[in-house]
């Protein structure tokens, strides 16, 4: 029966005399007058079985003590840790010449675990053991035992087991503890590869190469290997494993991503929170599912947010010139969360009597710069038929439009070719400028070419350079533009519309809003 004692993880104990309860019962030769098993109390007042001998009076002592058979357990090299106390010969009067201060350690390999006798000739010497310190007497009165500790190793071993023997040659000595152990590199996980308990090699300098196996839910990146050193330490980790998609490293394991998280690839990255507008409903997700109405394009990475098709373009303006039409519009209010927005133009030729009877324009119509995939917000359409009604649709599209096409993504305008539009307006004036508004007035075009149905005012902040403009329509020849920013330069254009369509815009009028209201008359050129 043995009690449990704690030793380093890289040592496997084969024999520990301190853990044995009851008599050790090792074999002594001679049976009497040599080594004697004696129980002493340790610092915790627990009895320890020790072997003592103190035959310092007689010369030529040859007292042997042999352990029981010790199994090798596959170890090729074993270590013997001896804790002992040794009396200083000077403390023993009248023993000079016969008293010694060393003893000898021997071993004998055997497959037989029941050898009853000590045959000295079978044993090989490991070493002569001397004390680092010897004591006049060993003070355990205060229960602090002054012990020498010596460690020796022996190998390579090949038989099933072995015996140890201690030869006394005339010392006053007590063996307090004998521990036999071998060293192993303990089971460990490095770089997500598990390396098994590995017994060290036969030599004190040998390295044992060990291949690791990837932990659960991981895969090899490079073949994982390590070397088990003679001291039971793992050395030189090579290669590694990576957690599979849907798993991340936590404390040397690959754990499934939590709900609401995902990992798309086998990498050393952690699980990431699902991107905006997506979710995962199970552990170990490799991607996240898009929310209803949101989509992921084929070439979108799993890390990208789910997006949706854009809303319709804004502020579509048409300008008819005989059999050509110029269309211009603003970006949609909602791009769907994507940058890859483009525009497609749909041309429909409609009957004069029934505008609902429309059909595609066909290949004779030409578009500049192109009909589909427009990156700019304007297009020129030429080679139209004269005196014909056309409906043009501008569709805003992005990478996910194909998953959910809807009329809400387009804006349309209907025009008739080959009717003269009004001429441009010659003079636009700023009648009053305040901090937040500008009052505009203008003259009728020189050539109205019909009844002017309305005027269209286009304006934008000067430094926006027409990237973002607004449109105001009015039947009168004046209007108040409100909701402006103070001390900001604005550019205004006005044009007229008749049944034939819109005329050209006027020359720009530049006005800067004030901090103090004032009346300023524009002359069609810059005004401040």
């Amino acid at each position: 029966v043995t009690g449990s004692r704690v030793y380093p993880a890289n040592e496997v104990t084969l024999l520990d005399s301190r853990s044995v309860q009851g008599e050790l019962g090792w074999i002594a030769s001679p049976l009497e007058g040599g080594w004697e098993e004696v129980s002493i109390m340790d610092e915790k007042n627990t009895p320890i079985r020790t072997y003592q001998v103190c035959n310092v009076m007689e010369a030529s002592q040859n007292n042997w003590l042999r352990t029981d058979w010790i199994t090798r357990e596959g170890a090729q090299r074993v270590y013997i840790e001896i804790k002992f106390t040794l009396r200083d010969c000077n403390s023993l009067p009248g023993v000079m010449g016969t008293c010694k201060e060393t003893f000898n350690l021997y071993y004998y390999e055997s497959d037989n675990d029941k050898e009853r006798f000590i045959r000295e000739s079978q044993f090989g010497k490991i070493d002569t053991i001397a004390a680092d310190e010897s004591f006049t007497q060993v003070d355990i009165g205060d229960r602090i035992m002054k012990l020498n500790t010596e460690i020796r190793d022996v190998g390579p071993l090949s038989k099933k087991g072995f015996y140890l023997a201690f030869q006394d040659v005339g010392a006053c000595i007590a063996l307090v503890s004998v521990r036999v152990f071998y060293k192993k590199c303990p089971l460990t996980v490095r770089n997500l590869a598990q390396f098994p308990d590995t017994i060290t090699g036969a030599d004190t300098s040998s390295l044992v190469e060990v291949r690791g196996s990837c932990v659960n839910n991981s895969e090899e990146k490079d073949v994982p290997k390590m070397y088990c050193g003679a001291d039971g330490e793992w050395l030189v980790p090579i290669g590694n494993c990576l957690c599979n998609a849907g798993h991340e490293e936590q404390n040397g394991e690959c754990q499934a991503c939590k709900i609401g998280y995902y990992k798309a690839l086998s990498t050393d990255a952690s699980c990431a929170k699902c991107p905006p507008h997506s979710y995962s409903v199970w552990e170990g997700a490799t991607s996240c599912t898009c929310d209803r109405g949101f989509f992921r394009a084929d070439n979108d990475a799993a890390s990208m947010p789910c997006t949706r098709p854009p809303s319709a373009p804004l502020n579509l303006i048409s300008n008819v010139n005989e059999t050509s039409v110029n269309l211009e519009w603003s970006s949609p209010q909602n791009t769907g969360g994507r940058q890859d927005i483009s525009y497609n133009v749909v041309c429909k030729k409609c009957g004069a009597g029934d505008p609902s009877k429309c059909r595609p324009c066909g290949s004779g119509v030409h578009y500049t710069p192109q009909q589909n995939g427009l990156k700019t917000t304007r297009v020129s359409i030429t080679d139209l038929l004269a005196h014909t009604n056309y409906t043009f649709e501008i569709w805003a599209v992005n990478g996910v439009s194909k998953y959910n096409p809807s009329p809400d993504q387009s804006v349309s305008v209907t025009v008739t070719t080959n009717q003269a539009a009004p001429s441009s307006i010659a003079l636009v004036q700023a009648k009053e400028v305040t901090r937040y508004s500008v009052a505009l007035a203008w003259l009728e075009p020189d050539r109205p070419n019909g009844v002017i149905l309305e005027y269209e005012v286009k304006y934008y902040e000067k430094d926006q350079n027409e990237r973002s403009y607004r449109i105001v329509r009015t039947a009168a020849r004046n209007t108040d533009i409100k909701g402006l920013n103070p001390l900001t330069s604005y550019v205004f254009h006005v044009r007229a519309r008749t049944a034939a369509g819109y005329g050209d815009f006027s020359e720009p009028l530049e006005v800067t809003t004030n901090t103090v209201p004032s009346r300023i008359i524009g002359d069609g050129a810059n005004s401040t």
Epitope: C54, G94, D139, I140, A174
Partner: antibody, heavy 121, light 106 residues
Framework: QVQLLQSGAEVKKPGASVKVPCKAS????????MSWVRQAPGQGLEWMGW????????TYAQGFTGRFVFSLDTSVSTAYLQISSLKAEDTAVYYC??????????????WGQGTLVTVSS | EIVLTQSPATLSVSPGERATLSCRAS??????PPWYQQKPGQAPRLLIY???TRATGIPDRFSASGSGTDFTLTISRVEPEDFAVYYC????????FGQGTKVEIK
């Protein structure tokens, strides 16, 4: 069993000598040292010294050099204490005692029954 | 030379009581001293030696402790046969005894 047998009482005149034997039995005589202890009447114990029974090498305590001699006859497993030039103050019981040496401490584990030496004119 | 002083010189106890005997060294000694028991007209008998080990045949009511300069022999429950004189002893290059403590019946 282990025994130490001493001779009976001795009465000696001052200036005379006495040789007190101590015969060992029940163990290997040469394996253990032999101590000699004096106890004067009504007094405590006094260690006189010991002899290495293997080498014959004696060790004398302070105050017991000169007139006191330890000797052996290993052939009959006997140790001897010889006192010469006896004085009245040498009157005492003389004990032989086998020495027990251990790493953790020494002691005298087997004692003879003692020999009373009386010095009187 | 190390001098051992035992106290008290006489200790009166009743059978069944605990007896504590003291042994003080004039300088620090490196291990527990052995203790001896001597009854009138008899040779001393070894009670306890190194590492507080009881000698063969000594009952476990006898125990020893201490370190440095102060040592104690304890008889946990004194029996009638325990009334005697007790000596401690120091060993080193020269051995010396204390003057003894007499344990008598109260």
């Amino acid at each position: 069993q282990v025994q130490l047998l001493q001779s009976g009482a001795e009465v000696k005149k001052p200036g005379a000598s006495v040789k007190v034997p101590c015969k060992a039995s029940g163990y290997t005589f040469t394996s253990r040292a032999m101590s000699w202890v004096r106890q004067a009447p009504g007094q405590g114990l006094e260690w006189m010294g010991w002899i290495n029974t293997n080498t014959g090498n004696p060790t004398y305590a302070q105050g017991f050099t000169g007139r006191f001699v330890f000797s052996l006859d290993t052939s009959v497993s006997t140790a001897y204490l010889q006192i010469s030039s006896l004085k009245a103050e040498d009157t005492a019981v003389y004990y032989c005692a086998r020495v027990r040496l251990t790493v953790y401490g020494d002691g005298m584990d087997v004692w003879g029954q003692g020999t009373l030496v009386t010095v009187s004119s | 030379e190390i001098v051992l002083t035992q106290s008290p010189a006489t200790l009166s106890v009743s059978p069944g009581e605990r007896a504590t005997l003291s042994c003080r060294a004039s300088q620090s000694v490196s291990s527990n001293p052995p203790w001896y028991q001597q009854k009138p007209g008899q040779a001393p008998r070894l009670l306890i030696y190194g590492a507080s080990t009881r000698a063969t045949g000594i009952p476990d009511r006898f125990s020893a402790s201490g370190s440095g300069t102060d040592f104690t022999l304890t008889i946990s429950r004194v029996e009638p046969e325990d009334f005697a004189v007790y000596y401690c002893q120091q060993y080193g290059s020269s051995w010396t005894f204390g003057q003894g403590t007499k344990v008598e019946i109260k």
